[in-house]
Interface confidence: low
Amino acid sequence: SGTTNTVAAYNLTWKSTNFKTILEWEPKPINQVYTVQISTKSGDWKSKCFYTADTECDLTDEIVKDVKQTYLARVFSYPAGHVESTGSTEEPPYENSPEFTPYLETNLGQPTIQSFEQVGTKVNVTVQDEWTLVRRNDTFLSLRDVFGKDLIYTLYYWKSSSSGKKTAKTNTNEFLIDVDKGENYCFSVQAVIPSRRTANRKSTDSPVECMGHEKGESRETGHHHHHH
C-alpha cells in the first residue's frame, strides 16, 4: 500500500567520514517530504529529520552512541503539507538503507601533518589527531581514541631534490625517521586501518609539507615554525 502521489525514496547511501555520518537518497522531492528512521538490529526505530524536503539527513548523533553497532535506516515519503494524523492507518511508502557499521565503514578523513622537528639526522613528524563526534563520559574522542591500535599512519618522505620515496609507519601519531644532514625533505601521511579489506582502508594523502617551509622547526637553524 502507499500514500497518494508519493514516490518511495531510492538510492539510499551512507556518507561517513571520521564518523560524521549522513544518509543521502533520491529523488529530489516534488510535492512530497521525507522522514528518516534509524535503529540498531535489536533496537527501536528513532525518527529524525521530520517532514524534510532535503534528500539527506545527518545521523551522526545516533551512530556515535555505539560505533560498533550495525545500523539500518529507512526513509518514509509523505505528501507535501502532510500533518501526522492519528486516524491514518495507511503506511507511507518507504525504502530501507543498506546496513551500516560505523567502526568498519566510516571513511578515514584526510590527515594533517601537525609539525615536524629536526634534531641532527633525525626528524620527528607528528600527525594531528582528528577529533570525532564520538563521546565517552561527555568527552569527545579523537580518531586515535576510537580506533586505538587498529589505526596506523604511513609516512611518505623524500628528499626535495629527488623523487625516490621512502615509507615509515607508526601506530601512534608520531614518526622518528633518519635523514641525511643538510638535505631538505618533504612529507605526506596517510591514515590506514590495516584490518579493513575494503576500499575505505586508507585515507587520502595529507597535503605535502616540506622542510624549509612554514611547518616545522629545526634545532640546527634555530627556526621555530610550530603549527597547531
Partner: antibody
Framework: QVQLQQWGAGLLKPSETLSLTCAVY????????WSWIRQPPGKGLEWIGE???????RYNPSLKSRVTISVDTSKNQFSLKLSSVTAADTAVYYC??????????????????WGKGTTVTVSS | EIVLTQSPGTLSLSPGERATLSCRAS???????LAWYQQKPGQAPRLLIY???SRANGIPDRFSGSGSGTDFTLTISRLEPEDFAVYYC?????????FGGGTKVEIK
C-alpha cells in the same frame, strides 16, 4: 604466543548442523580476521569464511547459504555453524588467524596461526 | 573465483636437491595476497611465505618465493629431510580466498 584451541561435535548425521568453536589464547581478537578452513580426507584446503573482531564477515559463496561465523569478544572466541550437512562436508576443520601486516608500503594477509584441526564426520 | 593450479602434483627428489614448485592463477593476483603453506600428515598447515616472497618468522632461508601476476614460484634451495611434505599456495585478495591443489614433495 597466540594459540588457537578448537572444539565441537565430531560425528554428525546428514541434515544436522555442524558447530565448532575456536578460542584465542595469548592474544586479542582485535585487529585480525579469523578464518575457518576445511580439508576433506586426502584432498586440498578450502576456505569457508572469516570474521573480523567487530563482526564483519566474508563467506565462500559456495557455502554462504549454509554458513554462519560469529564472534564473542567477551570470551575471546569465534564459532562456525554449517547447516544441513551431508557426507560431502566430512573434513578436518581448521580455525586460523588471518593477519593483516604492513611492511614498507605493502599490506600482506596471511594465516599465521592455526588450530590443530577438528575431524568432522557426517554419516547416517 | 580465482583458481590456483599447482604443478607438478608430485615432486620426487632426494635430500640436498633443489625443489621448484609452481603456482599459476587463473586471474592476476596482487602479490601482497599470495602465501605459501607447508603441511605434514596429521598436522595443520604452517605459513612459509607471505606477500609472495617474504619468509614467515622462523622459516629457514632455504625457502624462497618469487613471481607476480599469475605465475608464482616456491623454491627450496636444498631439501632437508623435514621438508618432505605437501605445499599449498593461497590467494587472500579476492573472495573466495582460494588454495592451490597442492604439490607433494616426496623422497625419491
Amino acid at each position: 604466543q597466540v594459540q588457537l584451541q578448537q572444539w565441537g561435535a565430531g560425528l554428525l548425521k546428514p541434515s544436522e548442523t555442524l558447530s565448532l568453536t575456536c578460542a584465542v589464547y595469548g592474544g586479542s581478537l582485535s585487529g585480525y580476521y579469523w578464518s575457518w578452513i576445511r580439508q576433506p580426507p586426502g584432498k586440498g584446503l578450502e576456505w569457508i569464511g572469516e570474521i573480523g573482531a567487530s563482526g564483519s564477515t566474508r563467506y565462500n559463496p559456495s557455502l554462504k547459504s549454509r554458513v554462519t561465523i560469529s564472534v564473542d569478544t567477551s570470551k575471546n572466541q569465534f564459532s562456525l555453524k554449517l547447516s544441513s550437512v551431508t557426507a560431502a562436508d566430512t573434513a578436518v576443520y581448521y580455525c586460523a588467524r588471518d593477519t593483516p601486516y604492513y611492511y614498507e608500503g605493502g599490506y600482506y594477509y596471511y594465516m599465521d596461526v592455526w588450530g590443530k584441526g577438528t575431524t568432522v564426520t557426517v554419516s547416517s | 573465483e580465482i583458481v590456483l593450479t599447482q604443478s607438478p602434483g608430485t615432486l620426487s627428489l632426494s635430500p640436498g636437491e633443489r625443489a621448484t614448485l609452481s603456482c599459476r592463477a587463473s586471474d592476476s593476483v596482487d602479490s601482497s595476497y599470495l602465501a605459501w603453506y607447508q603441511q605434514k600428515p596429521g598436522q595443520a598447515p604452517r605459513l612459509l611465505i607471505y606477500g609472495a616472497f617474504s619468509r614467515a618468522n622462523g622459516i629457514p632461508d632455504r625457502f624462497s618465493g618469487s613471481g607476480s601476476g599469475t605465475d608464482f614460484t616456491l623454491t627450496i634451495s636444498r631439501l632437508e629431510p623435514e621438508d618432505f611434505a605437501v605445499y599449498y599456495c593461497q590467494q587472500a585478495g579476492v573472495v573466495p580466498y582460494t588454495f592451490g591443489g597442492g604439490t607433494k614433495v616426496e623422497i625419491k
